[in-house]
Interface confidence: low
């Protein structure tokens, strides 16, 4: 059936366009041939001008951006909120773990404080930085903790008679710590647990932050001119014929949207994989892959490692006495 | 400065826990997030349809606009877009994604690879060792998912997990101390706080 005759005076079109663009100079008084139109190609007289067409295209693209943003609002909020909650939660766990460890030293080995507090503090600062993405080696962190602790344990608990004036025995003791496996297999155990749990935690946070980036990227996509033309055709060209109340056909809308969003939809495959991979990671985040479990239990393992040193104290003192004799002689002088 | 003292030690076993789980763990928060994220798994493929359903589209009207003319909603013309001499929809799709989309796809590929690499191999941790098979009693630990309700119906096995304390209000200090380690009874080991 032929379209109904356009509004003889373009009055309806004028009042609608007024809402989009105050100032009426672009709307024809009466229908015109519209030979200059590039998008809303008329089948007869039209109430649209080239300038109006441009305005419609701009509005259509803005509409599309707003629709896209409202579509992703709930998802975006979900990931942003959770990324913040987990970031905060992990920081709290690290803070608690540090305090548990310091408290263990204070209650069980008061002679090792405050040096132990300092080493523990440095260790957990590194842990926090690692989770946030710093390029720190976990094994180095753990080694540094035990390398720093052993000289204090030796001079304060195992051989408290050593004068504190000269400290060059410390370097020898740091070396002896590794050579003699002073703490047994505890440092290795801590390395394994801490590195596994922190790696998983770090990648979990990275994944959430990338999720936000993905949504932000698609949220702020600028749609192409071609897309703008298709949207204008669908949403606004009917107005040129005075058909103000007509809505686009559903199938037609789907075709247009698929065209406009062809690029965005390509993300789908990787987005699905992202969620399923994240689920797999989360399912495995327990025991040594759960930083909460590992870090909050760390003070207990460190306690065990010091007890191990104490248990082997006699043998160690003799061996270290020989190994670091040169340093000790210089100290006694 | 104040904070909550908590129980610290956990038994290395899987617990029987009633389906109502009260105090939460970080792991339950993670699982809840994943469940919610999974409801968005088709987000991108569903976007065109979502946008059409949230913008004016003829639903109950007999007539609708196909880009060129007014047509019957169920006619063949309704799906046509009247763009034949404008530009080709196929061409638009062939252009490929914008550079910014290509970049984000590359980042997704990279994180997906990392996530797969990091995921715990099924055989390793998920293998049930003897102590997890419930040979020991299925008691709940303070630092684990609590037993809520009576045993029997509605009981499920959940993973052993330290309780997470979200204590943001106060900074901790060294005086907030775990008690001396009691090797005799790990189950009932407590953190005590010292007070001035």
């Amino acid at each position: 059936q032929p379209p109904p005759p356009p509004d003889a005076t373009c009055h309806q079109v004028r009042s609608f366009f007024q809402r989009l663009q105050p100032g009426l100079k672009w709307v024809p008084e009466t229908p015109v041939p519209g030979s200059d139109l590039q998008v809303c190609l008329p089948k007869g007289p039209t109430c649209c001008s080239r300038k109006m067409e441009e305005k419609y295209q701009l509005t259509a693209r803005l509409n599309m951006e707003q629709l896209l943003q409202s579509a992703s609002m709930e998802l975006k909020f979900l990931i942003i909120q959770n990324a913040a909650v987990f970031q905060e939660a992990f920081e709290i766990v690290v803070r608690h773990a540090k305090n548990y460890t310091n408290a263990m030293f204070k209650n069980n080995y008061p002679s090792l404080t405050p040096q132990a507090f300092e080493f523990v503090g440095e260790f957990f600062t590194d842990v926090s930085l690692y989770i946030l993405g710093s390029d720190i080696n976990v094994d180095d962190m753990v080694n540094e903790l035990f390398d720093s602790l052993f000289p204090v344990i030796y001079t304060q608990m195992m051989n408290p008679g050593l004068p504190e004036s000269v400290l060059d025995i410390n370097e020898c003791l740091r070396g002896a710590r590794r050579d003699l496996k002073v703490f047994g297999s505890f440092p290795k155990l801590i390395m394994t647990q801490v590195s596994k749990s922190l790696q998983v935690t770090r990648i979990f946070l990275q994944a959430l932050n990338l999720g936000i980036e993905v949504i932000n990227t698609t949220d702020h996509l600028k749609f192409s001119k071609d897309c703008g033309r298709m949207l204008t055709r669908m949403w606004y060209c009917s107005y040129c014929q005075g058909l103000m109340m007509v809505k686009p056909c559903g199938g037609y809308c789907n075709v247009v949207m698929q065209g406009c969003m062809a690029g965005v939809v390509e993300i789908d495959k990787y987005w699905r994989e992202y969620i399923l991979s994240l689920e797999e990671l989360v399912n495995g985040m327990y025991r040594i892959y759960d930083m909460e479990n590992v870090l909050l239990g760390l003070f207990s393992t460190i306690h065990d490692s010091i007890q191990y040193v104490q248990k082997n104290g006699g043998k160690l003192t003799t061996t270290i006495g020989k190994l670091c004799a040169h340093s000790q002689q210089r100290q006694y002088r | 400065s104040a904070y909550y003292p908590e129980d610290l030690f956990i038994d290395k076993k899987i617990l029987k826990v009633a389906h109502v789980e009260h105090e939460e763990t970080l792991s339950s928060r993670r699982r809840e997030l994943i469940q919610k994220l999974k409801s968005f798994i088709n987000f991108y493929s569903a976007l065109p349809g979502y946008i059409c359903s949230h913008s004016p589209v003829a639903e109950n009207d007999t007539l609708c606009w196909n880009g060129q003319e007014l047509v019957e909603r169920y006619s063949q013309k309704a799906a046509r877009n009247g763009m034949k001499n404008q530009f080709n929809l196929h061409e638009l799709k062939m252009k490929g994604p914008e550079p910014v989309v290509s970049q984000i796809i590359d980042k997704l590929k990279h994180i997906n690879q990392l996530l797969r690499t990091m995921s715990v191999p099924k055989g390793k941790v998920l293998d049930k060792s003897l102590d997890e098979e419930g040979l020991e009693s299925g008691d709940c630990g303070d630092d684990e998912d609590e037993c809520i309700g009576s045993s029997g119906d509605g009981m499920v096995k959940v993973k052993n997990q330290l309780r997470f304390l979200a204590e943001l209000a106060y900074d901790l200090d060294v005086d907030d101390a775990p008690g001396n380690k009691q090797h005799g009874n790990q189950k009932d080991n407590e953190i005590t706080t010292s007070h001035s």
């Epitope: 909120q81 909650v85 905060e88 939660a89 709290i92 | 909550y4 003292p5 908590e6 129980d7 109502v20 789980e21 009260h22 105090e23 939460e24 763990t25 339950s28 928060r29 809840e32 997030l33 008691d139 709940c140 630990g141 303070d142 630092d143 684990e144 609590e146 037993c147 809520i148 309700g149 309780r163 997470f164 304390l165 979200a166 204590e167 943001l168 209000a169 189950k187 009932d188 407590e190």
Partner: antibody, heavy 120, light 112 residues
Framework: AVQLVESGGGLVRPGGSLKLSCAAS????????MSWVRQTPETRLEWVAY????????YYPDSVKGRFTISRDNAKNTLYLQMSSLKSEDTAMYYC?????????????WGQGTLVTVSA | DVVMTQTPLSLPVSLGDQASISCRSS???????????LHWYLQKPGQSPKVLIY???NRFSGVPDRFSGSGSGTDFTLKISRVEAEDLGVYFC?????????FGGGTKLEIK
């Protein structure tokens, strides 16, 4: 400082409804399980509702089950209690309280309360 | 539900005296994990309840050491070694071993 501020209390007829709110600040609300605890005119305390930090789990004792609904909006740091089919025995001061997550059932922070009076 | 019974209902004391409040539960509060979830709260006039002691005998941070908790199974006691003016108010015991969590009826500590 931690603050829990209840509002929405008032006088309501038996069978009526009321919605209480609790605005939280000074702590990570979205990581805490929350509860409503009421105190009757005879000063007796009763635990009436619980909601987990993400809102997935709720719990009600038999005395209010089916009549009260606890909910939360973590974006707004707000806890709610929708009360319907109110009875005279629901007259009480209603407190919102946060649960310590590590110590089972230990109400750590309490608000100042909002008074609900159910009377004809 | 577990019924918590507190005695006495009212406890008049002189400042500096020792005060003792008893709390009895209708069933054992020992959880299957070995812990006993019996807590004490203090509600000062015009205020909301505040935590004092958790799990029978652990003082909350900042609680003076004149407060101590003891007991096991079904019988528990809160002691204040030397009552001070700021200790006046209503003391509640509470259990969270069994769901629903329940409270005692309260004991009012007042000056003689």
């Amino acid at each position: 400082a931690v603050q829990l501020v209840e509002s929405g209390g008032g006088l309501v007829r038996p069978g009526g409804s009321l919605k209480l709110s609790c605005a939280a600040s000074g702590f990570a609300f979205s990581t805490y399980g929350m509860s409503w605890v009421r105190q009757t005119p005879e000063t007796r305390l009763e635990w009436v509702a619980y909601i987990s930090s993400g809102g997935a789990t709720t719990y009600y004792p038999d005395s209010v089950k089916g009549r009260f609904t606890i909910s939360r909006d973590n974006a707004k740091n707000t806890l709610y209690l929708q009360m319907s089919s109110l009875k005279s025995e629901d007259t009480a001061m209603y407190y919102c309280a946060s649960l310590s997550i590590m110590i089972r059932g230990w109400f750590a922070y309490w608000g100042q309360g909002t008074l609900v009076t159910v009377s004809a | 539900d577990v019924v918590m019974t507190q005695t006495p209902l009212s406890l008049p004391v002189s400042l500096g005296d020792q005060a003792s409040i008893s709390c009895r539960s209708s069933q054992s509060l020992v959880h299957s994990n070995g812990n006993t979830y019996l807590h004490w709260y203090l509600q000062k006039p015009g205020q909301s309840p505040k935590v004092l002691i958790y799990k029978v005998s652990n003082r909350f941070s900042g609680v003076p050491d004149r407060f101590s908790g003891s007991g096991s199974g079904t019988d528990f006691t809160l002691k204040i070694s030397r009552v001070e003016a700021e200790d006046l108010g209503v003391y509640f015991c509470s259990q969270s071993t069994h769901v629903p969590y329940t409270f005692g009826g309260g004991t009012k500590l007042e000056i003689k």
